[in-house]
Amino acid sequence: MVPPPENVRMNSVNFKNILQWESPAFAKGNLTFTAQYLSYRIFQDKCMNTTLTECDFSSLSKYGDHTLRVRAEFADEHSDWVNITFCPVDDTIIGPPGMQVEVLADSLHMRFLAPKIENEYETWTMKNVYNSWTYNVQYWKNGTDEKFQITPQYDFEVLRNLEPWTTYCVQVRGFLPDRNKAGEWSEPVCEQTTHDETVPS
């Protein structure tokens, strides 16, 4: 009897949908695996007789509950199927946005870039998929614990009237208010402000 794949799960970030599993212990030799998806009531092969322990399902439609399954095989024997259900638009993890930061005197000027999507045109981003897409920004003085959060209305934001000659750190994430779903934070970007622009009288 061939044991089934273990720890079968979907790892999906920005609609890059990778079904992953672990190979079970099997004394007779090396196992191969076949992964399938349900399409119009028929299971279709996606990865056949692969020695890998993952299979890319990024070409699935973004909407709908998809049934995926994987089994282990050895010679002419095979395990039972292990099934999972996956809805990309609900289940995919929102990866960190890009961010460009520029210091202008005592201000930080930030521009945000929505994450790109696997199997899409360069310009079709997570912002196109989710109508309610917005950004959360948090910033803090480097070396302090107190963080401030803002929700920009656009793809850019300016933090004004900051302390001069002070290093501020900023990070951004995508947020979907209608789903109350937050994405992953970007890596912090830390920049030092320069002089105060105000001219003494």
Partner: nanobody, 124 residues
């Protein structure tokens, strides 16, 4: 049921232009995304371009960027694909498709309704 009808295909010399039309019955152009795809002989379906109803944004495959332009005329319920500087490798059957949810642009899996296609041949 939505019906999409493509027209405007034909034989054109390299460097020439064509304008494809995708006419829709009903209000299908209210759908969030309308896309153009093509299938060259012996090859799979390839995304070419799409237009989003929500913001009018247009999106293109790298292979056609700067040469093809997608647009829509809501009064005529029609989407157009203006194809300039055509090359032999643009030879294909071109299909338009409509998406109910508008979640995707390039992947055929994200579209719900399809036209029957129009042949474009680029040859001297």
């Amino acid at each position: 049921e939505v019906q999409l009808v493509e027209s405007g295909g034909g034989l054109v010399q390299p460097g020439g232009s064509l304008r494809l039309s995708c006419a829709a019955s009903g209000n299908s152009l209210d759908y969030p995304t309308i896309g153009w795809f093509r299938q060259a002989p012996g090859k799979g379906l390839e995304g070419v371009s799409c237009i989003s109803a929500s913001d009018g944004s247009t999106h293109y495959a790298d292979s056609v960027k700067g040469r093809f332009t997608i647009s829509r005329d809501n009064s005529k319920n029609t989407v157009y694909l203006q194809m300039n500087s055509l090359r032999a490798e643009d030879t294909a059957v071109y299909y338009c498709a409509a998406s109910l949810l508008g979640l995707g642009c390039k992947s055929e899996a994200d579209y719900d309704y399809w036209g029957q296609g129009t042949q474009v041949t680029v040859s001297s």
